[in-house]
């Protein structure tokens, strides 16, 4: 670099350096300038920080005319405001440990960085920044309408939501439904909920629907066969009337149940479907409610616990009627 | 980094009980449910059984009567019992982490013979 | 008994296009399945690729797809490369428990 020449100064007043950029002069003496940080670009006109131990490395003697800023062995390292040694490692947060190594920081994440795709588990999991912890964990988000747990969640456990179906996808409106929630009654006439917005505003509405899981006036361990342990589906002998608040169906149902075991097992409806039933009530008025029909019954061993509903029996789904929720509401 | 292991026995007689052990790293036992999948030799994989980030479990009902899964958040260990082994059985055991089977172990070769 | 059903072999050229399908004997295939598919290529370990239909873990390329597709899961591999040669498992959820599918051997010539 040519010094020789007078000293020109693109400003007369001394440049801002950004914090924790030192203003030093120029290679001729004559001007004052940021100094050039680790790794960048720099010339006699434009040297290095000095007092982050950084050099302008001009590589081989060819090349004379720029350089990269170097640090020298040992230099020590500005960080956040603060000078850590060469060697030193330090938290420059909960979240990160960084080490000083010849005048270059190197910061490793001490969170996760994790992923989580959908389970049956997990069906919407996001991360969140809880109280009191440095780094965000994975939470499974559930229907806003789950918040009460009460005597409806006795028999069975929760029922998961079910992530966006891109064949679903309308205009403007991502079409969700939850899974049906199971049955308010282990046996008796109960009630079972989602949470969709397929409807014509997409606006979040709670469908509900009748179901009765078994009749509690059935003697079933009595069908249950020699030698075996359970029965999953027994047969209902003749067609049944349901009633509700004393109002009778006004039609007769051959309708499935889920059986009882004897070996400690339980038995949920597996696979379900919904259709409407007609009521006639004592006064003459006809009611239409959406009933619960189960096609099939599972037995397993995942029963309620006393003490936490959840423990068992939060991942076994009643697999309902969700590819067609869209047909009868 | 994520990573699970596999441990237990390399041969087993019939009729004795596999013991498998898979130890987590990377990641929380509360937070995440852990799978066990087999594989017997040259045949395709077979879902076993899984315990939920909740401590909950399920089975594949195949083997129902004779597997038990268990966990250990503390030491970050997923514990499978299979009763009554039988050659049938011989396969290599995984252990994979719930939430798209994304991480998977190496897994452990079982043999049963008398 | 419920039987997920793979292609057993696909062959593709490189930079072509192949779908991988899994079909569920017990009717169509739901996003309540949760369809997972999972890769091994030869001498690795598993990893999963896709999870909750169409959702890609990380190291998954964006030349993987997963979908619902005539009321079966599928894979589609656009543009594949030639690294994308894999045993490919898909796995679903029934309510209680996973079936695997018998896997599907994807060759990718040259």
């Known amino acids: 670099q040519d010094c020789s020449a007078q000293c020109q100064c693109a400003a007369e007043a001394a440049p801002h350096c950004p914090a924790g950029v030192s203003l030093v002069l120029d290679g001729c003496g004559c001007c004052r300038v940021c100094a050039k940080q680790l790794g960048e670009l720099c010339t006699e006109r434009d040297p290095c920080d000095p007092h982050k131990g950084l050099f302008c490395d001009f590589g081989s003697p060819a090349n004379r005319k720029i350089g990269v800023c170097t640090a020298k062995d040992g230099a020590p390292c500005v960080f956040g405001g603060s000078v850590y040694r060469s060697g030193e490692s330090f938290q420059s947060s909960c979240k990160y440990q960084c080490t000083c190594l010849d005048g270059a920081v190197g910061c490793v994440p001490l969170c996760s960085m994790d992923v989580r795709l959908p389970s049956p588990d997990c069906p919407f999991p996001r991360r969140v920044k809880l109280p009191g912890k440095c780094c965000e964990e994975w939470v499974c988000d559930e229907p806003k309408d789950r918040t009460a747990v009460g005597p409806a969640l006795a028999a069975y456990r929760l029922e998961d939501t079910f992530g966006p179906d891109p064949t679903m996808m309308r205009a403007n409106c991502l079409v969700q439904t939850t899974e049906w929630s199971a049955c308010s009654k282990t046996c008796g006439m109960g009630i079972s909920t989602r949470v969709t917005n397929d409807n014509t505003f997409c606006r979040l509405e709670k469908q509900s629907r009748l179901c009765m899981v078994r009749p509690c006036e059935a003697d079933l361990e009595e069908n249950i066969k020699k030698g075996k342990k359970c029965i999953r589906t027994p047969k209902i002998a003749k067609p049944v009337k349901f009633e509700l608040s004393g109002c009778t169906s006004v039609k007769t149902y051959r309708a499935k149940f889920c059986g009882v075991c004897t070996d400690g097992r339980c038995c949920t409806p597996h696979r379900t479907t919904t259709l409407p039933v007609e009521f006639k009530c004592p006064d003459g008025e006809i009611m239409k409610k959406n009933m619960m029909f189960i096609k099939t019954c599972a037995c397993h061993y995942n029963c309620p616990g006393d003490n936490d509903i959840f423990e068992s029996l939060y991942y076994r789904k009643m697999y309902g009627d969700m590819a067609h929720h869209h047909h009868h509401h | 980094e994520v990573t699970l292991k596999e441990s237990g026995p390399v041969l087993v007689k019939p009729t004795e009980t596999l013991t498998l052990t898979c130890t987590v790293s990377?990641?929380?036992?509360?937070?995440?449910?852990v799978h066990w999948i087999r594989q017997p030799p040259g045949k395709a994989l077979e879902w076993l059984a899984v315990?939920?980030?909740?401590?909950?479990?399920d089975y594949n009902a195949a083997f129902m009567s004779r597997l038990t899964i268990s966990k250990d958040t503390s030491k970050s260990q997923v514990v499978l019992t299979m009763t009554n082994m039988d050659p049938v059985d011989t396969a290599t055991y995984y252990c994979?982490?719930?939430?798209?089977?994304?991480?998977w172990g190496q897994g452990t070769t079982v043999t049963v013979s008398s | 008994e419920t039987v997920v059903t793979q292609e057993p072999s696909l062959t593709v050229s490189p930079g072509g296009t192949v779908t991988l399908t899994c079909r569920s004997s017990?009717?169509?295939?739901?996003?309540?399945?949760?369809a997972n598919w999972v890769q091994q290529k030869p001498g690795q370990a598993f990893r999963g690729l896709i999870g909750?239909?169409?959702n890609r873990a990380p190291w998954t390329p964006a030349r993987f797809s997963g979908s619902l597709l005539g009321g079966k899961a599928a894979l589609t591999l656009s543009g594949v490369q030639p690294e994308d040669e894999a045993e490919y498992y898909c796995?679903?959820?029934?309510?209680?428990?996973?079936?695997f599918g018998g896997g599907t051997k994807l060759t990718v010539l040259g």
């Open positions: 994979a982490r719930d939430g798209g089977f994304d991480y």
């Open positions: 990377g990641f929380s036992l509360s937070t995440f449910g």
């Open positions: 315990i939920w980030r909740r401590g909950g479990t």
């Open positions: 796995a679903l959820w029934y309510s209680t428990h996973y079936v």
């Open positions: 017990i009717g169509a295939v739901t996003t309540s399945n949760y």
């Open positions: 909750g239909t169409s």
